[in-house]
């Protein structure tokens, strides 16, 4: 007998994938900076704001070119399931302040959890070893007051801006070693 | 069209040792992840093994650690499962697959016995 | 003992809708790990039927579709044909592995 019949293509390639993860990265890290300027034409921030309960940035980008695949798509899917964390936190504290930016918070919150299911797919499809996630942490207190809630907001989607813009190019430098 | 083609199956003594093969054709063989999975006679599936798209992670089931050895070659598009210590209850079909598994080969009977 | 547990068999009669459980633990599907789906017809080697908890691959009839919640997964298969005949089989990654899982396996039969 012949060869056996083969199997038509019949999901993207990693490096597609990757492609179109970039592709969604971008469009993620769009959507935060054009709700960051609605948060800040709605509730001027005065100077930088910190949340404790953030990840802390996970490399500058000169330092990416020492940063292995593994690594990389790891700590970018840990700190991303935490802002989605924070972005649900959000919503459920702040649904009434925050109705101004309620569709897009929604959106947000969509296209993230969308960009981790990518991230985990293409993981699995490079066979890379996946860090089990980190034990659940504890429910994140509800803000104090209203501004305690818009100044987590500022703290959240200045974090999550910075993180996006990190995991772009990570993710365009990580696409020469495929 | 995706194509892995097994081979290197047959019977062997318990104890024995077997090399198999899995050629791969119609896709970019370096970029996937590779697992072999295997199928006892009217059983289900069990993965034995997996090694990463550029081969630097290796990792096994249980059952086969320590007695197995997966590989690949990206030059010859090939990847390879060297099975020691054979046992019966190795008996199976193996899949070489490749993904998550997106794409499986028909598989090669791999018989222990005396 | 699959670390993933399906029922062994399920059945329906042609044009109706069944569905597979797939039923995993916090360690696995609750962990936020994707579940995948394959189709084994009688006497070939498996196909990925649905990834990523409900993505088809392209070929496969939109009348499979899947779905995930909390620590389960589940197949449905609507208007159900007779060559739907064969074993299901759910999947997902089990870090304590660095592999997948495979769920014992589902038997479909078309009445």
């Known amino acids: 007998p012949g060869p056996p019949p083969g199997s038509p293509r019949a999901s993207p390639d990693p490096r597609a994938e990757l492609d179109s993860t970039v592709l969604l990265t971008r469009s993620l890290l769009e959507d935060t900076r054009q709700l960051t300027i609605q948060l800040k034409d709605k509730f001027p921030a005065d100077g930088d704001h910190n949340l404790d309960s953030l990840p802390t940035l996970a490399m500058s980008a000169g330092a990416l070119g020492a940063l292995q695949l593994p690594s990389v798509l790891t700590r970018l899917r840990a700190d991303l399931l935490s802002y989605l964390r924070h972005v649900q936190w959000l919503r459920r504290a702040m649904g009434s302040s925050l109705k101004t930016l309620e569709p897009e918070l929604g959106t947000l919150q969509t296209r993230l959890d969308r960009l981790l299911r990518r991230l985990q797919l293409l993981m699995s499809r490079l066979a890379l070893p996946q860090l089990p996630p980190d034990p659940p942490a504890p429910p994140l207190a509800p803000p104090s007051s209203t501004w305690g809630g818009i100044r987590a907001a500022h703290a959240i989607l200045g974090g999550l801006h910075l993180t996006l813009d990190w995991a772009v190019r990570g993710l365009l430098l990580l696409k020469t070693r495929l | 069209e995706v194509q892995l083609l097994e081979s290197g199956g047959g019977l062997v003594q318990p104890g024995g040792s077997l090399r198999l093969s899995c050629a791969a054709s119609g896709f970019t063989f370096s970029s996937y992840g590779m697992h072999w999975v295997r199928q006892a006679p009217g059983k289900g599936l069990e993965w034995v093994a997996v090694?990463?798209?550029?081969?630097?992670?290796?990792y096994y089931a249980d059952s086969v650690k320590g007695r197995f050895t997966i590989s690949r070659d990206n030059s010859k598009n090939t990847l390879y499962l060297q099975m020691n210590s054979l046992r019966a209850e190795d008996t199976a079909v193996y899949y070489c697959a490749a993904g998550v598994p997106d794409y499986w080969g028909q598989g090669t009977l791999v018989t222990v016995s005396s | 003992q699959s670390v993933l547990t399906q029922p062994p068999s399920a059945s329906g009669t042609p044009g109706q809708r069944v569905t597979i459980s797939c039923s995993g633990s916090s360690s696995n599907i609750g962990s936020g790990y994707d579940v995948h789906w394959y189709q084994q017809l009688p006497g070939t080697a498996p196909k990925l039927l649905i990834y990523s908890n409900e993505e088809r691959p392209s070929g496969v009839p939109d009348r499979f579709s899947g779905s995930k919640s909390g620590t389960s997964a589940s197949l449905a298969i609507s208007g159900l044909r007779s060559e739907d005949e064969a074993d299901y089989y759910c999947?997902?990654?089990?870090?304590?592995?660095?592999?997948?899982?495979f769920g014992g396996g589902t038997k479909l039969t078309v009445l």
């Open positions: 999947a997902a990654w089990d870090p304590s592995l660095s592999g997948p899982v």
């Open positions: 090694i990463s798209y550029d081969g630097s992670y290796k």
